[in-house]
């Protein structure tokens, strides 16, 4: 009776409803559900659709752009309980942009344990005010209902009853108003008393068991569940999983085989991002806290004696840390078997943050390489590496690798830190303010001295306070597209062309042509350039045939204009002249695009034959916009306006009066005041700061969350396997 | 209607020297990259050359590197190459073609042979 | 020896659906998108299909172009006898810094 059917997986089904039918047999969404980007389907295609047996999801519940879709009373009967165990941005469940949705219809959801509810931009969506949302969640001053039909007050939601003079539906009151509540005209809300708090109530109001969860088919049987409050287990509720059961996903009790087979799919598996399993605390979770380390006998979790000894495989070999965020990435481990590359420019708190995530390393078996991390001062952040083996060797046989870092003054504190480099030599060029003894120092201490070559350690580039190129490197071929820069350069070959060492890209939006190179870099690190390494070009001894150096840039931002600039990095000649090349700071705007969609379209009838159309343009125009196309199609009548009567008591007028959408903002204000001021004797009040950093914050955190949703449901499209099992998606 | 039509072709000895020209109608020259792509007899296209919009920027695959040059006159909306040093293998029919999103071929000439043959 | 690769040839009888595939690598396909031109005998390319799945006008919806990974695919439902032609795909290479095309594929209808 409890959970009747399967537990299925987290579905996302989107651009046709061949998939929905994945979901026939499922209880419970281990997961959340996605359903989005329909734009062919009509409502006739949802006539016979309905899922009677889903009663919860552990997730979230989100419909985006779904066209034909009228209501959720068929397709989802009992949905009983959101879970919001993992949320889609603070939400539980997410309407948006359900352009035929008119009511919702989830007559049966009575518990949204965790989350908030965000309905927005839904233009024929009504049946809103007549639900009381604080008897389902806790937090309604999170919600987020804005945007829907409802906002003009010109739906006129009839509950059960009402046409017939009847009030069917139990009231409550919100903000005042003592309101019938129900989802639909054919659906009431169900409201328990009070005492029951969440758990649920019978049709006659008798409280279910305490262990339940929004409903159940007979009061205060823990068997008779419509969902569980807390855990699930062998068709009964329960407060706790008892051994030898463990909590799984925050809902169900699973056995130890359960655990231990999810642990070994994984496992033997070559999916990235899969999980194995472990038990800890009672619970069968991902992975093991921090503090602790797998016993792989039995999965349990035991605390490490002293720090975990954590060994860190790195992927393809090698890890650059390029930010807190990649640090963290390491936290706890002890052996990085691979190479580690350092590439901090900036950021708050850095040596505390990266003290914190890569302080416990005592061991790197590849090499260690720094470079371009202007912010970093020193490398006493690895507190405890006391080893290097150079078991794999940066180009040049390098195990440690200083590059560029414009502030590193110090390496370690070298009375009190020892580092061994097993094999390998030091590169050390372009570190201004780092001293020579202190690198010769190095060299004493990690038993490299001897190693060196004439070029590894620059005489002149570390520990100096300038450097200079003394020629000027042109662009040869510059091509654009909307997201990519094409540039190449003509060669530059020092006298002994083994001195080149390469090539330094900088490149950053830059919307006047008025910037120079020294823009926004400070002694902190902060640097608004985008740099990038680029190896010389193979060398030709025919000059006519010599290669151009270039780079490809690429995820750039379309119609917009960057300044570049590419210059040598070149090592020091022994007559201690210095040679190399700049070229100037040129300008380039990628191409146009296409833009994204207009925002906030709003209809206005001014007349039986006119529609007015009101938009706002594209967050992101991508280019000049030129026009816009309009499309519009003739809807079928809706029935149930027919049906309606509006003489009935209770029923609003719209309350909109109409305007020339297309007036300035300033002139409706103008009129708007004009005519309060003749109506009532007062002009609206002008809106307080408050008021207006309320708005800007509201206009913000609404984009926040369209971009946030545009880019979880927007993904690169999968191949179709032929199983049928991966859904095509919209790039 | 969009349009290309290639000429100049014929038959040229080993070293010798050509010049082909296209020239464009139907649309406005100036505002795209424009390549040449060639097709030797009972092979696949090969692309020859690129020049962008107002002519500044060239670039050539590396079999004929330094031997072509590409041109263009956006006054009379014709496209050139200059192929000198010529050799038996440049045997090809070629085509003029518009570039987009950096790939030759969303508007194509109908050809023109040259052959190089002693 | 093309950079792209495509099989030399392909049939199929009037009616029936059939497929051309291009492979390439992580510089090409892999991060590019691909254009495929049919060539009918004697003729000049002609473009069918632009950024992955795209069709200029004018292109029968009958063609359709997929991009999966570092391969394409061009599709061709409904066969009929005027398709007999060859089918060039092509995409821009990184690493080459050029335009790349595949050898190219000859459909025959039975």
């Known amino acids: 009776h409890l959970y009747p059917g399967e537990v299925c997986p987290g579905m996302d089904i989107r651009n046709n409803l061949t998939r929905l039918h994945e979901l026939e047999n499922c209880s419970v969404i281990e997961g959340h559900l996605q359903i989005l980007l329909m734009f062919k389907t009509r409502p006739e295609d949802f006539r016979d659709l309905s899922f009677p047996k889903l009663i919860m999801i552990t997730d979230y519940l989100l419909l985006f752009r779904v066209y034909g879709l009228e209501s959720l009373k068929d397709l989802f009967p009992n949905l009983t309980v959101i879970r919001g165990s993992r949320l889609f941005f603070n939400y539980a469940l997410v309407i948006f942009e359900m352009v035929h949705l008119k009511e919702l219809g989830l007559y049966n959801l009575m518990n949204i344990t965790r989350g908030s509810v965000r309905i927005e931009k839904n233009n024929e969506l009504c049946y809103l005010a007549t639900i009381d949302w604080s008897r389902i969640l806790d937090s309604v001053e999170d919600n987020y209902i804005v945007l829907n039909k409802d906002d003009n007050e010109e739906c006129g939601d009839i509950c059960p009853g009402t046409a017939k003079g009847k009030t069917n539906c139990p009231a409550t009151v919100i903000n005042g108003q003592f309101v019938e509540r129900c989802w639909t005209h054919s659906h009431c809300q169900k409201v328990c008393p009070t005492i029951c708090k969440s758990h649920g109530c019978t049709a006659e109001g008798l409280c279910c068991h305490s262990e339940c969860l929004g409903n159940c088919s007979q009061p205060d049987d823990p068997t008779k569940c419509v969902a569980c409050r807390n855990f699930y287990l062998d068709g009964r509720c329960v407060e706790t999983c008892p051994p030898p059961y463990y909590h799984f996903q925050d809902w169900r009790c699973v056995n130890f085989s359960f655990c231990q087979d999810l642990h070994h799919k994984c496992k033997n598996s070559r999916r990235q991002g899969c999980h194995q399993y472990v038990i800890h605390n009672n619970k069968c979770i991902p992975e093991c806290p921090s503090g602790y380390t797998m016993n792989s006998s039995n999965l349990l979790c035991t605390p490490c004696l002293g720090p975990c000894p954590k060994v860190c495989h790195l992927l393809e070999g090698e890890k650059t840390i390029d930010s807190v965020t990649s640090a963290q990435e390491l936290r706890g481990c002890t052996v990085i078997n691979g190479s580690l590359i350092i590439n901090i420019r900036g950021g708050n708190n850095l040596a505390a943050e990266l003290e914190a995530n890569l302080g416990l390393i005592e061991e790197i078996s590849g090499y260690l390489k720094i470079r371009r991390s202007y912010a970093l001062v020193s490398l006493s952040f690895f507190r405890k590496l006391r080893l290097i083996r150079g078991e794999t060797l940066e180009i040049g046989n390098y195990s440690f690798y200083a590059l560029d870092n414009q502030n590193l003054r110090q390496l370690w504190d070298w009375s009190k830190h020892n580092l061994t480099i097993t094999q390998g030599k030091l590169f050390f060029h372009y570190n201004p303010k780092l001293c020579l003894s202190e690198i010769h120092k190095m060299e004493e201490v990690s038993g490299t001295k001897g190693r060196q070559e004439r070029n590894d350690i620059a005489l002149k580039t570390n520990g100096d306070q300038a450097s200079c190129e003394n020629e000027l490197l042109k662009f040869s071929y510059i091509r654009t597209s909307f997201d990519k820069i094409l540039l190449r350069w003509e060669p530059y070959w020092p006298p002994d062309f083994r001195d080149l060492l390469g090539f330094m890209l900088f490149y950053k939006e830059a919307p006047y042509q008025n910037v120079t190179e020294f823009d926004g870099q400070d002694a902190c690190g902060s640097n608004s350039w985008t740099v990038v390494d680029i190896d010389p070009p193979l060398r030709s001894n025919d000059p006519k045939s010599q290669n151009h150096p270039g780079w490809l840039m690429r995820g750039l931002k379309p119609w917009t204009q960057y300044a570049i600039f590419v210059k040598t990095l070149v090592t020091f000649s022994d007559e201690r002249r210095t040679y190399g090349a700049k070229s100037d700071i040129i300008y380039v705007q990628t191409d146009a695009t296409n833009p994204s969609v207009p925002l906030d379209p709003i209809s206005v009838s001014n007349s039986s034959s006119q529609i007015i159309l009101k938009w706002k343009p594209p967050s992101d125009p991508n280019g000049n916009i030129t026009h816009y196309l309009v499309f519009w199609e003739r809807q079928a009548e809706d029935s149930e306006l027919f049906e309606l009567d509006y003489c009935l008591k209770g029923l609003k007028l719209p309350s909109r009066t109409w305007s020339p959408p297309f007036e300035s903002e300033d002139s409706q204000k103008h009129n708007q005041s004009e005519y309060e001021d003749s109506a009532g004797e007062c002009c609206s009040c002008p809106k307080t700061d408050s008021q207006i950093l309320k708005e800007l914050e509201e206009s913000s955190f609404r984009k926040t969350f369209e971009d946030y949703l545009h880019n979880v449901v927007f993904v690169p499209r999968k191949t179709s396997s032929g199983t049928g099992a991966e859904d095509p998606r919209p790039s | 209607e969009v349009q290309l039509l290639e000429s100049g072709g014929g038959l040229v000895q080993p070293g010798g020297s050509l010049r082909l020209s296209c020239a464009a109608s139907g649309f406005t020259f100036s505002s795209y990259w424009m390549s040449w792509v060639r097709q030797a007899p009972g092979k696949g296209l090969e692309w020859v050359a690129v020049i962008s919009k107002d002519g500044s920027s060239t670039d050539y695959a590396h079999s004929v590197k330094g031997r072509f040059t590409i041109s263009r006159d956006n006054s009379k909306n014709t496209l050139y190459l200059q192929m000198n040093s010529l050799r038996a293998e440049d045997t090809a029919v070629y085509y003029c073609?518009?570039?987009?999103?950096?790939?030759?071929?969303?508007?194509w000439g109908q050809g023109t042979l040259v052959t190089v043959s002693s | 020896q093309s950079v792209l690769t495509q099989p030399p040839s392909a049939s199929g009888t009037p009616g029936q659906r059939v497929t051309i595939s291009c492979s390439g690598s992580?510089?090409?396909?892999?991060?590019?998108?691909v254009n495929w031109y049919q060539q009918l005998p004697g003729t000049a390319p002609k473009l069918l299909i632009y950024d992955n799945n795209k069709r200029p006008s004018g292109v029968p919806d009958r063609f359709s172009g997929s991009k999966s990974g570092t391969s394409a695919s061009l599709a061709i439902s409904g066969l009929r006898s005027e398709d007999e032609a060859d089918y060039y795909c092509a995409a821009w290479d990184d690493s080459l810094s050029g335009p790349v095309f595949g050898g190219g594929t000859k459909l025959t209808v039975l």
């Open positions: 073609a518009r570039d987009r999103d950096w790939i030759p071929g969303d508007v």
């Open positions: 992580s510089s090409n396909i892999g991060s590019n998108s």
